[in-house]
């Protein structure tokens, strides 16, 4: 999940020098940018979120808003400041003519401006059938801990909080920020207004059909009776949660956002801030049978984004559309014909479908995990959700071909025990956005702030790439992949792990002159090899060179093609041990895999040799996958020989710490 992607319209309005009487001009060379939703029908022109630079104080925000009003008035325009943001993002919400955008972009402290846009509930349809009573025996599901230490915030429609399923479990806050319903003849029927929110509250914490039966909830109304809201209303809701958290700090917080709109820089930024304040955000991937990266908050990297599967673990089809997919989805969860509280009556049940229902399942699982281990960080929780998921059960044929490799084949599940996973070395795979096809294009994959980048690989469908390297960016390692001339673009693939007290560094060897190939090892005492990367400047990496094989007995070393620079990720962490596992196939093969055995975690995945017919390498759960070009296009047998190299690690320190706890 990347912040800077999405089929997103960015209009940079250059600053003009004739601005009248600006006391403080913007910093030299900076240009504030204007953003709007790429989906035209969802745009709400006339209302704008003006986002100010990070360090801007509330008083400066208010002053900037007043200044905009004054300058607009001098031009004969009326403006209305609807809200001044502080607590999450500095800025303000203003109702004004689009003619004033150029003026607003020149104001001091302005970082960017985003036109408001719509967000929508992600359940379709809203009343398939009435089900009374629920279709299962309550005995079947008695969780050990019902999430009683956790508060779940629900940003949704109004809800029927006295429904028998959820009475006493949901506190309806006084927060309400919703647009008017569309259509002059719209009839506000209470039960329909409450439908979406009531159902989701029931899925999260319902007495009989809920996941986390002990969780208490707080609801904020950001969606109207038609299930429609705005980015600005959602932002103000997230700010309300942050302020509540500051006024009255409680235990762990989970925020459920069962809604989606077009890609929104400001909504993603607000989610990032809230996540960094220790809040777990769970959102619907969206019901558009599309790349989730094109929607918000689904595309926010800090948010846990959930796609929907059915009882057969297949992606959910919703009419002509269905669940979203792609690299911005973290995992899938049940989202078809989900039984929950119906607002039609106080004892009614209904089944609803969608990524909203899937997200509610994951919010419930998260509440239970956090109740059992309240100190879990967002990164730890995400890694556990991934670790305990059912793997490789989704039929990927449902997804577009180019999205299959990017979409996680994971269906959320409750851990067998809510305790005792501490010994595990947890890792996950993070794909970058596509680089684009230009010669010098690169793609960057990043880990979360409290994860370690243990290895970096790259993948190109055309095979035209120039490898990858780990490099420092803002004090953290990132994984950068390089496109090659004539290539259609590359992906960078980061292996992101939870490794407490780790000290990792990258050791690089430049291309070797000798024919033996390039090699680099971890020479520091106590450092172990966790990943290998190779990067080359030449367009075609010696197609007819013989393959380079790793010398036996040198597990702490990366080897590669003599024309490539080789990068070794070397880490020191208490009790960390790693080993190299290889699987070579002499005959041409489109895919070669090697897996780490039980108790070991895959940290590194690379290919030998790094020749141009290798499309790339990537980790899928605990398996290293190396993909090659279609064998029919491969020349000689020797050229077709590929070895998948996995680096498998475990932490004796984590295992011991876990045993001491038990």
């Amino acid at each position: 999940q990347e912040d800077e992607d999405g089929d997103y319209e960015e209009l940079v309005l250059a600053l003009r020098s004739e601005e009248d009487g600006l006391a403080e001009a913007p910093e030299h060379g900076t240009t504030a940018t204007f953003h709007r939703c790429a989906k035209d029908p969802w745009r709400l022109p006339g209302t704008y979120v003006v986002v100010l630079k990070e360090e801007t104080h509330l008083s400066q925000s208010e002053r900037t808003a007043r200044r905009l009003q004054a300058q607009a008035a001098r031009r004969g325009y009326l403006t209305k400041i609807l809200h001044v943001f502080h607590g999450l993002l500095p800025g303000f919400l203003v109702k004004m003519s689009g003619d004033l955008l150029e003026l607003a972009l020149k104001l001091p402290h302005v970082d960017y401006i985003e036109e408001d846009s719509s967000v929508f509930a992600q359940s379709i349809p809203w009343n398939l059938e009435r089900i009374t009573p629920p279709r299962y025996r309550a005995d079947e599901y008695q969780p050990p801990d019902g999430g009683s230490l956790v508060e779940v915030y629900l940003l949704d429609t109004s809800i029927q909080s006295d429904h028998r399923e959820i009475e006493g479990r949901v506190m309806v806050t006084d927060f309400e920020n919703v647009p008017e319903e569309d259509g002059t003849r719209f009839h506000r029927q209470a039960s329909k207004c409450d439908s979406h929110g009531t159902h989701l509250a029931g899925v999260v914490s319902g007495r009989d059909a809920g996941v986390a039966k002990g969780a208490s909830m707080r609801s904020l109304r950001v969606l109207n009776c038609q299930g429609k809201g705005t980015v600005s209303g959602t932002l103000i809701g997230l700010e309300f949660i942050r302020k509540s958290q500051l006024v009255q700090p409680v235990g762990p917080l989970v925020v459920l956002l069962p809604l989606a709109g077009g890609y929104s820089r400001v909504l993603n930024a607000a989610c990032q801030r809230l996540a960094r304040a220790g809040v777990v955000l769970v959102t619907a991937a969206g019901n558009f049978r599309d790349d989730a990266c094109l929607y918000s908050p689904a595309s926010a990297p800090e948010v846990i984004t959930v796609g929907a599967t059915n009882a057969q673990d297949q992606p959910v089809t919703l009419g002509t559309l269905g669940t979203n997919f792609g690299r911005c989805v973290d995992l899938f969860a049940p989202g078809e014909d989900i039984i929950g509280a119906s607002s039609d009556c106080s004892t009614c049940f209904v089944s609803q479908s969608g990524t909203s229902q899937a997200a509610a399942h994951v919010a419930g699982i998260a509440a239970m995990m956090l109740s059992a281990e309240p100190e879990l960080t967002l990164a730890e929780l995400r890694q556990r959700l991934i670790h305990f998921s059912a793997k490789d059960v989704i039929n990927e044929a449902w997804f577009p071909e180019d999205q299959r490799v990017l979409t996680p084949n994971l269906v959320a599940a409750l851990p067998p025990s809510t305790h005792g996973a501490g010994w595990q070395l947890f890792c996950r795979t993070v794909w970058s956005a596509h680089s684009g096809p230009t010669r010098m294009a690169t793609a960057v994959a990043r880990c979360a702030p409290d994860e370690e980048l243990l290895s970096c690989s790259s993948f190109s469908r055309s095979g035209k790439r120039r490898g990858e390297r780990m490099e420092a960016q803002g004090g953290k390692l990132v994984c950068r992949a390089h496109n090659a001339f004539g290539g259609e673009g590359v992906y960078a693939i980061a292996r992101c792990c939870l490794l407490p007290q780790a000290n990792c560094s990258v050791h690089t060897a430049p291309p070797a002159e000798a024919s033996m190939g390039t090699r680099v090892h971890c020479h520091q005492q106590g450092h172990v090899l966790t990943g290998c990367s190779s990067h080359w400047e030449v367009e075609d990496l010696g197609t007819h060179k013989p393959p380079v094989l790793r010398p036996r007995g040198q597990p702490n070393q990366c080897v590669g093609h003599r024309e490539a620079s080789i990068h070794a990720s070397c880490c020191h962490a208490p009790g960390l041990e790693c080993k190299v596992k290889e699987h070579g196939i002499p005959a041409p093969q489109e895919q070669v895999t090697v897996a780490c055995e039980e108790g070991w975690t895959l940290t590194g995945c690379s290919a030998l040799p790094g020749t141009s017919h290798v499309l790339g390498a990537y980790a899928v759960d605990n398996t290293c996958v190396v993909r090659s070009r279609d064998v029919s296009t491969t020349g000689s047998t020797s050229e077709g020989a590929v070895t998948a190299v996995a680096i498998c690690c475990r932490s004796r320190h984590l295992a011991q710490a876990s045993q001491e706890l038990q």
Partner: antibody
């Protein structure tokens, strides 16, 4: 603290109606409805129905359906239970209780139906 | 005729444990997590002792515990005390309403 305070005892003739009130306080009213339960002398408990403070929706037990009406007055946080066409077997103590979970109870209102 | 069946009476000596059963069907006790137990002293309103099968409200002694197996719920009182002498009622959700048991008179000998 959370309280449900009911109106005083009533003596009614057969065929008449009775209206018992229950004033709620100390909690968020819209998070719970109010259940009505009655107990005939020396007998067990019988659930009569439920009303929502949130939207006024009701759910009546089949046995009293057609004779009972539950209403709310949100301005005074009060719920009313009216039972019509009283018979001698309606003689009972009538309780209001919070929600379907019935975790808090009123003190009870004795209704005597006698000619 | 109550929908849920309870023994009319049980007895025990101080310090002993007793169990009261509450039998229903798959449409009530067996189908829902929402079985409650109430204690009622003469002339007083009922008092919630156990909710959602096995949860105790705050302030209720841990001598009171609840469980459920299939269509039968149980209330166990350990370390019987004189003040436990009262009537005990179980209740359960049904699809659209609530049902009570006929009540069990507990005598502490």
């Amino acid at each position: 603290q959370i309280q449900l305070v009911q109106s005083g005892a009533e003596v009614k003739k057969p065929g008449a109606s009775v209206k018992v009130s229950c004033k709620a306080s100390g909690y968020t009213l819209t998070s719970y409805g109010i259940s009505w339960v009655r107990q005939a002398p020396g007998q067990g408990l019988e659930w009569m129905g439920w009303i929502s403070f949130y939207n006024g929706n009701t759910n009546y037990a089949q046995k009293v359906q057609g004779r009972v009406t539950m209403t709310t007055d949100t301005s005074t946080s009060t719920v009313y239970m009216e039972l019509r066409s009283l018979r001698s077997d309606d003689t009972a103590v009538y309780f209001c209780a919070r929600g379907y979970g019935m975790d808090v109870w009123g003190q009870g209102t004795t209704v005597t139906v006698s000619s | 005729q109550s929908a849920l069946t309870q023994p009319a009476s049980v007895s025990g000596s101080p310090g002993q444990s007793i169990t009261i059963s509450c039998t229903g069907t798959s449409s009530d006790v067996g189908g829902y997590n929402s079985v409650s137990w109430y204690q009622q002293h003469p002339g007083k309103p009922p008092k919630l002792m156990i909710y959602e099968v096995s949860n105790r409200p705050s302030g209720i002694s841990n001598r009171f515990s609840g469980s459920k197996s299939g269509n039968t719920a149980s209330l166990t009182i350990s370390g019987l005390q004189a003040e436990d002498e009262a009537d005990y009622f179980c209740s359960s959700y049904t699809s659209t309403s609530m049902v009570f048991g006929g009540g069990t008179k507990l005598a502490v000998l």
